[in-house]
């Protein structure tokens, strides 16, 4: 999977966490953006 | 010892192609997002985009999506970036970056200069 | 985009001093700003991450502070070792953005 990020970045956050895809693990199925 | 060993230094000519290459040892290489960062002495850093070593899902910056593709082979442990159509303005430093997620980008390669010129 | 604004862009100090260094976003990164020290011949090195953590290793005459648009690295008594290259980079949101860097130059 791909996703390209700009000036209208999508990233979803919680109020106190980044909105960084976190480490991958086994379970990832694609990266976020 | 956490390393990232990139592939030396590529002098290519205008509209050619180039694959730089990193290869990670010494920590978990699918456990952590693998990014790309480009240094030029006009426009300091700019991040690339990252790949995620077990699936191959990619994140880029946009101004990058038209000119880089990132890679992986999970068997050798390396990352890999292609830069195609390449101008003058591509010549700069591209570095390898692996990425914790708390810890943002906490090991870096040596960097891989990229000349462009005919 | 998140632009990030470094300065100052020069400084000059001598060893035993303190100085601080300002990065500003252009809007709130909460507290995800990370540090990294350039020095020629080395690989690019991550002194604090989350505005004010640490990296393991880091000497704690290095410290940051700050929290949503307005970060400070500081360094306490300059060591001989220190004068290189500092940049700032927000990790809250995608794309991760830079300032454009400091140099820190023996006085």
């Known amino acids: 999977s791909e996703t390209t990020t700009g000036t209208s970045s999508n990233s979803s956050q919680s109020t106190s966490n980044s909105g960084l895809a976190p480490n991958p693990t086994n379970a990832t199925t694609k990266a976020a953006g | 010892e956490v390393q990232l060993q990139q592939s030396g230094p590529e002098l290519v000519k205008p509209g050619a192609s180039v694959k730089i290459s990193c290869k990670a040892s010494g920590y978990s290489f699918t456990g952590y997002y693998m990014n790309w960062v480009k240094q030029s002495p006009e426009k300091s850093l700019e991040w690339i985009g990252e790949?995620?070593?077990?699936?191959?899902?990619?994140t880029y910056n946009q101004k990058f999506r038209a000119k880089a593709t990132l890679t992986v082979d999970r068997s050798s442990s390396t990352a890999y970036m292609q830069l195609k159509s390449l101008t003058s303005e591509d010549s700069a430093v591209y570095y390898c970056?692996?990425?914790?997620?708390?810890?943002?980008?906490?090991?870096w390669g040596q960097g891989t200069t990229l000349i462009v010129s005919s | 985009d998140v632009q990030i604004t470094q300065s100052p862009s020069y400084l000059a100090a001598f060893p035993g001093e303190t100085i601080t260094i300002n990065c500003r976003a252009s809007?709130?990164?909460?507290?995800?700003l990370a540090w990294y020290q350039e020095k020629p011949g080395k690989t690019n090195n991550l002194l604090i991450y989350?505005?004010?953590t640490l990296q393991s290793g880091i000497p704690s005459r290095f410290s940051g502070s700050g929290t949503g648009t307005d970060f400070t690295l500081t360094i306490s008594s300059l060591e001989p070792e220190d004068f290189a290259m500092y940049y700032c980079?927000?990790?809250?949101?995608?794309?991760?953005?830079f300032g454009a860097g400091t140099k820190l130059e023996l006085k």
């Open positions: 970056t692996k990425r914790d997620y708390d810890t943002s980008l906490d090991y």
């Open positions: 980079q927000q990790h809250n949101e995608y794309p991760l953005t």
């Open positions: 989350s505005g004010s």
């Open positions: 809007k709130s990164i909460k507290k995800y």
């Open positions: 790949i995620n070593p077990i699936t191959g899902g990619t």
